[in-house]
Interface confidence: low
Amino acid sequence: LPKAPVITTPLETVDALVEEVATFMCAVESYPQPEISWTRNKILIKLFDTRYSIRENGQLLTILSVEDSDDGIYCCTANNGVGGAVESCGALQVKMKPKITRPPINVKIIEGLKAVLPCTTMGNPKPSVSWIKGDSPLRENSRIAVLESGSLRIHNVQKEDAGQYRCVAKNSLGTAYSKVVKLEVEVFARILRAPESHNVTFGSFVTLHCTATGIPVPTITWIENGNAVSSGSIQESVKDRVIDSRLQLFITKPGLYTCIATNKHGEKFSTAKAAATISIAEWSKPQKDNKGYCAQYRGEVCNAVLAKDALVFLNTSYADPEEAQELLVHTAWNELKVVSPVCRPAAEALLCNHIFQECSPGVVPTPIPICREYCLAVKELFCAKEWLVMEEKTHRGLYRSEMHLLSVPECSKLPSMHWDPTACARLPHLDYNKENLKTFPPMTSSKPSVDIPNLPSSSSSSFSVSPTYSMT
């Protein structure tokens, strides 16, 4: 008698390893013999698909070589025209040994930044990922974490994080290891020991000492008044990633000597600098070495700051002093765009009067430095917050500018208007309450090394635009 199909062996979940054989059985009783079709995820499996074998009148479906993508719900449907079609479904779970699909790669990273070592895995059951540093399992902490993806994230990378790493992917079917990769930690150049300022007699020998560190070990260059040091002998030694440089000088003129430590990170450089002044005892007027001339200011940047038809000192060590000094001011003003409305006019006045110093004409034209009190007013009253930020930015190398040296004077080294009112220049555009100046004690001592108390301390008290790059 005709009999509607009945599935006597319902489909079950089948577990299979990649590249192995997986078989679903769909035993059917019926008369006449039914037609059996198979679907995967509701899509018909074609009889001529060579990846499958269908036997026993369609009751056996075999996947000949299981692939990762074969995961899904398989259904058999039996129909012989008597009664309705019947269906049974089961799942194929593809089991897979761990496989590392995106292994870690060698990384060079700057200290303090975030490092991510990738380790993307495949496998079923989902592999757990752990990391080995050197020969020991890596412990997670507040800085070091293994992400959901398996990647290793290290916040605020430290020197001690450098080393060899590999990731391990593990599930019930096996374990996979990545190749060993190297994490190299680079460190911005930093000055450990700044050169010290000296007040010496004409013809003395002075040794300036500068020590710096960084990874890679930085190089040290010395700058004299903005130019490469032309005389003097330099001795250098390197030990344990610390470079020590000594510049020996025969002193015939005063100068600002800057130690610049530079190291390279890929295509970028990081730079740290510290400056020292060499002053000559009894040095009151520039000698013939101090080449320059007095001329009316004809630039633009300082037009609103300098007195109309101001006579300024133009330094002939520049091929085009007007343009070069204009450029110096302009570059600094670029950095001043972000400072407060209180600080900006004061800082601009200080910069213009420092770079375009008032000039005393005569047989030997003489630049007149800014009075100490005006410098301190800018530093401590108008721009106290910005000054500290700028010093920190300079130290951390956050300025984009390439200027090798652009600094306002060290205030404490400037002459006081209490010593000789004609020996220093005032800032007429600095519109502050004269009472503010009285908060600075009058300088009774004749020693220029006496400091105003509570100045922000720094290895170089220059307010400078650093020649470094933002490492983005």
């Epitope: 390279k264 940047v301 091929a319 450029l327 302009h330």
Partner: antibody
Amino acid sequence: EVQLVESGGGLVQPGGSLRLSCAASGFTISSSSIHWVRQAPGKGLEWVASISSSSGYTSYADSVKGRFTISADTSKNTAYLQMNSLRAEDTAVYYCARKYSKRAYPDYYWRGLDYWGQGTLVTVSS
Amino acid sequence: DIQMTQSPSSLSASVGDRVTITCRASQSVSSAVAWYQQKPGKAPKLLIYSASSLYSGVPSRFSGSRSGTDFTLTISSLQPEDFATYYCQQSYWWPITFGQGTKVEIK
């Protein structure tokens, strides 16, 4: 005679990379800054990047920052522009140009690009 | 970024005409403006630097001037070889920016 010759252009798929070279003769690139300027078909000039060989200082237009890297090899008197993650909008003729710089100052207040190469075409298309 | 607004975008003129092209900077760029000439399929050529300085080898019929943030390129007597596209460019602030160009065509 001062000359700049670009090479390395060509057809590349989006997301791909190219490295352009700019070989200089008749002057040393260490005494100059080298700039890359591009021009999309039928469009105007767009500054891309520059390098001051003496200091290593580099600067980039926002549109290429993080994708392009300018460098220079003073021993070969050649500048390079490494272009990664290229996009269709990077399609252009790329020129290298020099700004002669007697002073060791950055190019904030410079005097114009006095010599240019003939240009090399970069086409980014799938 | 500094906008360099160049006008006109194109102009028709005859040989011998006096031609003036202007460029306005969106803020002060001092005198750091250069002018370039470009012919189809060729690289640009420097004509004027520092707003008004004539680059060596450039004919004296080309001149540049500045008034505040307005910059002008003048060709006193247009010659057949002057039909080209002209660009202004500022180099005072980064990024360096160019005007959109002025095409000088034969009337």
